[in-house]
């Protein structure tokens, strides 16, 4: 017994003066706590506590299930304990078969012994199958077998306590061994979609998928800069041991526009944390926005090809798409598609494909556009460059030689002289009249220049030449005259086109 | 065959009270701590409350402590769950299992967990 010097509290004195006692089942149990201020005896084995306020504990019978720890303790807090054994053959092992270990810590196989004397005192593989290699486990008779460091790979290990009793291998009742892993990874957290585009009233429904090796792991879904609680919903699944997978929904029944925003599915373990956004971006109706992908004002050459190309975006998804000219629609030749196949994708490219086109063909082409709640449009203007080409050329009866020219951009008419026989015309001759006509045609059509010098100025034989040009090409009329006497011959007009 | 078989669940008022009983056969009842565990419906499994293989030591979770009473009976393997003060929040079903695991996880579940007793709490 405890001895301590005078004045001080002492522990109580226990009789039986022994920390072990050994009874055999049946025997009496009779403990006697001896202290001025006792106040109670207590009992513990496995998860099992009793009081007993008497200070002396007697049991008559003594059971197996009465094998613990007694404890007397007085009014100091002082205490004293006797460990007693009650031997019983045909009940070797108190248990719990309770058995949860968590990964890389030990955990206690509790199936404490009645006898101590018993050898061998150790784990076995249930139906004979050997333990994991790496398992150790240290015995204690008082408290059963624990075992260290457990591993994930123990995991619903179906096992024994075992001791020799008589030369015979007695087995306890099974244990099956459950481990919770420890977190040595950030979950995995992803979400059903990384946008969302709403109209006002429609329900805002998003999923945030968790991966983790266990349920433990937390998630929330956080609205960026905001406290405030959001309500979601719940599932989960164990794919198997160690893959757990947790989808917490969010949902707004019906967005508003202040709804819009940043919403952030948190999960975190003792390892680390790891997060996933989503944007929401709520409008009051819907829109579509159109991009030219050239110029609106487009200048192609006669017989040349020309696509005219918008991106457009539209929410929700567009209805109906035409191309118009000159208040026809398109049937063929043009096509609409999605820019992207992903599945929020509001953005689509249309194509007009114009082939040859002729310099009657210039002009107004519209794309029109229209969802649900809005209409688009979009014109492009296009003219065709088409290469001078000379109307009229005359002599009339006042004398002026007058040249007509049609093309566009609009021609400019130049005027020489070539005296004689002279193929070179290099002389050149100021007209005296140029008019811009204004053409009967649909507009972006050719445009018409007039213009008139006077003949009464050649003195010589000669040919005069109007050369009609712009950025396209030039054509070129020539005038041939000739004098006899002092009377000028009839003008033979005749023209040379210059490629 | 091991048979978990709970029973005594039904519909009462907030603030009412239940008894809710489980009888244990084909396993060693006395081998084991025992647990009540509960799933509202759309939620994961909630351990409810837990005793020791002897009765001596019993363990509850916060949200029901001071209103629920577990306590068993190894002479009849039957395991019991005093529910006083209730309210709509405890709406589950209702299970017994085998096991307790202190840290309240459950990895893995249980040796043996039984179908369940529905108690609805409602006004």
């Known amino acids: 017994q405890p001895s301590v010097s005078p004045g001080e509290p002492s522990p109580p004195s226990i009789h039986p003066g022994k920390s072990d006692l050994i009874v055999r089942v049946g025997d009496e149990i009779r403990l006697l706590c001896t202290d001025p201020g006792f106040v109670k005896w207590t009992f513990e084995i496995l998860d099992e506590t009793n009081e007993n306020k008497q200070n002396e504990w007697i049991t008559e019978k003594a059971e197996a299930t009465n094998t613990g720890k007694y404890t007397c303790t007085n009014k100091h807090g002082l205490s004293n304990s006797i460990y007693v054994f009650v031997r019983d053959p045909a009940k070797l092992f108190l248990v719990d078969r309770s058995l949860y270990g968590k990964e890389d810590n030990d955990t206690l196989v509790r199936c404490p012994l009645t006898d101590p004397e018993v050898t061998n005192y150790s784990l076995k593989g249930c139906q004979g199958k050997p333990l994991p290699k790496d398992l150790r486990f240290i015995p204690d008779p008082k408290a059963g077998i624990m075992i260290k460091s457990v591993k994930r790979a123990y995991h619903r290990l179906c096992l024994h306590c075992s001791v020799d009793q008589e030369g015979k291998s007695v087995l306890s009742e099974k244990f099956i061994l459950k481990v919770r892993p420890a977190f040595k990874a950030v979950p995995v957290v992803s979400v059903s979609k990384a946008s969302y585009l709403l109209r006002e009233g429609e329900e805002f429904t998003v999923t945030c998928t968790i991966k983790d090796v266990s349920s433990s792991v937390y998630s929330t879904w956080k609205r960026e800069n905001s406290q405030t609680k959001l309500q979601e919903k719940y599932n989960s699944w164990h794919h198997g041991d160690f893959n757990y997978e947790r989808q917490a929904t969010l949902t707004i029944s019906s967005a508003r526009v202040n709804d819009s925003g940043v919403f952030m599915c948190y999960a975190n373990n003792t390892f680390g944390s790891a997060n996933v956004t989503t944007t929401l971006e709520v409008v009051d109706k819907g829109f579509i926005n159109i991009f030219p992908m050239i110029n609106t004002t487009v200048f192609v050459n006669d017989g040349e090809n020309v696509d005219l190309i918008v991106e457009y975006e539209a929410f929700p998804k567009p209805e109906h798409q035409q191309w118009i000219y000159m208040n026809r629609t398109f049937t063929d030749k043009w096509e609409d598609y999605p820019k992207s196949e992903n599945e929020s994708n509001i953005r689509y490219v249309s194509e007009l494909h114009l082939t040859r086109l002729k310099g009657t063909e210039g002009g107004t082409y519209t794309f029109l556009v229209s969802n649900s709640d809005v209409n688009a449009a979009i014109a492009f203007n296009v003219y065709v460059n088409t290469k001078p080409e000379i109307l009229t050329y005359d002599r009339l009866v006042n004398g002026m030689l007058q040249c007509v020219a049609a093309g566009f951009p609009e021609p400019t008419i130049d005027w020489y002289f070539c005296p004689g026989t002279e193929q070179r015309c290099s002389a050149s001759v100021l007209p005296v009249d140029v008019q811009t006509l204004n053409s009967s045609g649909p507009p972006f059509g050719k445009l018409v220049v007039q213009s008139s010098i006077d003949s009464s100025a050649f003195k010589h034989n000669g040919t005069v030449e109007c050369k009609a040009y712009n950025d396209v090409g030039k054509t070129s009329a020539y005038f041939n005259f000739a004098f006899k006497g002092n009377n000028k011959e009839q003008i033979h007009p005749h023209t040379l086109f210059t490629p | 065959e091991v048979q978990l078989l709970e029973s005594g669940g039904g519909l009462v008022q907030p603030g009412g009270s239940l008894r809710l009983s489980c009888a244990a056969s084909?396993?060693?009842?006395?081998?084991?701590?025992m647990s009540w565990v509960r799933q509202a419906p759309g939620e994961g499994l909630e351990w409810v409350s837990a005793i020791s293989t002897g009765g001596g030591s019993t363990y509850y979770a916060d949200s029901v402590k001071g209103r629920f009473t577990i306590s068993r009976d190894n002479s009849k393997n039957m395991l019991f769950l005093q529910m006083n003060s209730l309210r709509a929040e405890d709406t589950a079903v209702y299970s017994c299992?085998?096991?307790?695991?202190?840290?309240?996880?459950?990895?893995?579940?249980?040796?043996?967990r039984g179908q369940g007793t529905l108690v609805t709490v409602s006004s």
């Open positions: 299992a085998t096991g307790y695991d202190s840290s309240g996880y459950y990895y893995g579940g249980f040796d043996y």
């Open positions: 084909g396993f060693t009842f006395d081998s084991y701590a």
